[in-house]
Interface confidence: low
């Protein structure tokens, strides 16, 4: 059994993740990760689902967050900025947009890097799954520590 | 004795830091921090060695981030983009990279100024040590709050 | 009685709110946030002042966050960068600056969008409060998610 | 303990193979640019090939179309198959990493300052 599992006791145990980005040959625009390189999956009360969610298993307050690096030219792009969303789908009920990020595209030739960080506390009901959705997946950089995702309890 | 010390128990304090950027006349990429300003160290559990790196003395999850505020000019600068990495030394292992940003250069003239977050939840272990490397480190701001670095033990 | 209370127990209480950004009419630098939407407000150790302002009741260390993304255009801006600062005032003190980010306008027309993420570990008297200043408020986005403030109890 | 391994040299004749592997311990070696360089006696070091830890790859001139690096993941592994090997290709050959090679990580480079960690090396000799 992982070792962070009973650091704070049965009735609380630590639960934390940090998942990795993956190039997806899929057109989705939600991003996909893995549990690769120096990932953090606490225990069994927060799993990465199909690769695209976080999925915890109790209800209480998470400090979630997502880092996205993408690369982009103004020219070679749509005009509207690029945007990365943190969602959240709970049991029951719709998605719902928890935070957004948008950086115009850059001028630079082929294209410009930017980085965009995400975060912030929200309530989770037990079966909630948060995942990174973003407008042109094709920009994302996938080099060693440059997208991540990730949450921690409270 | 610090007052965070003991707000958790002999057994599990809270262990944070959060030190403030300083100038260097060093020519090293690694970005020098000290404890000045409102900076937090919550106790002994986490010390700043050589103003360059976090250490820790207890295993376990931690929150680690950084900001860096900088100020660069696409035609003064090198093709290649700013980067700011947050890299893990542990004890008789390689240094790695844990989290990345990639900034392009500014257009602006002299140069235009861009910050850079970084955040996540990692292991480490006791003895290891987290430092902050920059591709280059005479474009970093370091006016009050600009640049900083810190974790928090979950 | 709020179900987050009683999480950690009597003696330590659960303490983080997250706000969401609200626009204003008024001329101030100061950014207005409101209880609305997928916030949190965990119980009353921390509240929402004025609209402007989160303010603690118990002492100790806070990990403190801002994210404003904004809209702007070189020509139409002044030459300064656009800058978010996360700033303390303590009872009877003067306020401080904890931290700042600092972007510079975008080329983009009629506005390039920028966000800007702010976080930190900080020790917060009873009766500390923390605010968010901008250059120019009228260039911040207020959609959904795009701008929000929070901190979380450690 | 971080150590690189090498193995596979010997002697071969002209227009042989031989498989060079590189061995990583004390580390996940999927995650680092990992570089083949070479060293002929009385000669400077030279990069030979490398590979990124996102699996792209680059060659010297000199044995474009002749050698092949890959990397096996599962075995902590990275292979140098060299091809119509040559006399002028007998040196001792060094795999060598650093935790920050590439661009994004999807390129490396074959020049010997890059890098920071070095095999003891295995030896190639190309003689009839």
């Known amino acids: 059994e992982n070792s962070f599992e009973m650091q704070k006791g049965d009735q609380n145990p630590q639960i934390a993740a940090h998942v990795i980005s993956e190039a997806s040959s899929k057109t989705t625009s939600v991003l996909q990760w893995a549990e690769k390189g120096y990932y953090t999956m606490s225990n069994n009360l927060v799993t990465l689902e199909n690769g695209k969610q976080l999925t915890v298993k109790r209800q209480g307050l998470y400090y979630i967050y997502a880092q996205v690096t993408f690369c982009s030219n103004r020219e070679a792009s749509s005009q509207a900025p690029f945007i990365a969303s943190l969602c959240l789908k709970s049991p029951g009920r719709f998605e719902r947009i928890l935070l957004r990020a948008a950086n115009t595209h850059s001028s630079a030739k082929p294209c410009g890097q930017q980085s965009i960080h995400l975060g912030g506390v929200f309530e989770l009901q037990p079966g909630a799954s948060v995942f990174v959705n973003v407008t042109d997946p094709s920009q994302v950089s996938h080099g060693t520590g440059f997208t991540s995702f990730g949450l921690l309890k409270l | 004795e610090n007052s965070f010390e003991m707000q958790k128990g002999d057994q599990n304090p809270q262990i944070a830091a959060h030190v403030i950027s300083e100038a260097s006349s060093k020519t090293t990429s690694v970005l020098q921090w000290a404890e000045k300003g409102y900076y937090t160290m919550s106790n002994n559990l986490v010390t700043l060695e050589n103003g360059k790196q976090l250490t820790v003395k207890r295993q376990g999850l931690y929150y680690i981030y950084a900001q860096v505020t900088f100020c660069s000019n696409r035609e003064a600068s090198s093709q290649a983009p700013f980067i700011a990495s947050l890299c893990l030394k542990s004890p008789g292992r390689f240094e790695r990279i844990l989290l990345r940003a990639a900034n392009t250069h500014s257009s602006a003239k002299p140069c235009g100024q861009q910050s850079i977050h970084l955040g996540g939840v990692f292991e480490l272990q006791p003895g290891a040590s987290v430092f902050v490397n920059v591709t280059d480190p005479s474009q970093v701001s370091h006016g009050t709050g600009f640049t900083s670095f810190g974790l928090l033990k979950l | 009685e709020n179900s987050f209370e009683m999480q950690k127990g009597d003696q330590n209480p659960q303490i983080a709110a997250h706000v969401i950004s609200e626009a204003s009419s008024k001329t101030t630098s100061v950014l207005q946030w409101a209880e609305k939407g997928y916030y949190t407000m965990s119980n009353n150790l921390v509240t929402l002042e004025n609209g402007k302002q989160l303010t603690v009741k118990r002492q100790g260390l806070y990990y403190i966050y801002a994210q404003v993304t904004f809209c702007s255009n070189r020509e139409a801006s002044s030459q300064a960068p656009f800058i978010a600062s996360l700033c303390l005032k303590s009872p009877g003190r003067f306020e401080r600056i904890l931290l700042r980010a600092a972007n510079t306008h975008s080329s983009a027309k009629p506005c390039g969008q920028q966000s800007i993420h702010l976080g930190g570990v900080f020790e917060l008297q009873p009766g500390a409060s923390v605010f968010v200043n901008v250059t120019d408020p009228s260039q911040v986005s207020h959609g959904t998610g795009f701008t929000s403030f929070g901190l979380l109890k450690l | 303990e971080v150590q690189l391994v090498e193995s596979g040299g010997g002697l071969v004749q002209p227009g042989g193979s031989l498989r060079l592997s590189c061995a990583a311990s004390g580390f996940t070696l999927e995650y680092y640019a990992i570089g083949w360089f070479r060293q002929a006696p009385g000669k400077e070091r030279e990069g030979v090939s490398c590979?990124?830890?996102?699996?792209?790859?680059s060659y010297t001139d000199s044995v474009k179309g002749r050698f092949t690096i890959s990397r096996d993941n599962a075995k902590n592994t990275v292979y140098l198959q060299m091809n119509s090997l040559k006399p002028e290709d007998t040196a001792v050959y060094y795999c060598?990493?650093?935790?920050?090679?590439?661009?994004?990580?999807?390129?490396?480079?074959?020049?010997?300052?890059?890098?920071?960690?070095w095999g003891q090396g295995t030896l190639v000799t190309v003689s009839s």
């Open positions: 060598a990493t650093d935790p920050d090679r590439g661009f994004l990580g999807s390129s490396c480079d074959t020049q010997s300052h890059q890098y920071d960690f």
């Open positions: 590979i990124s830890s996102e699996g792209s790859t």
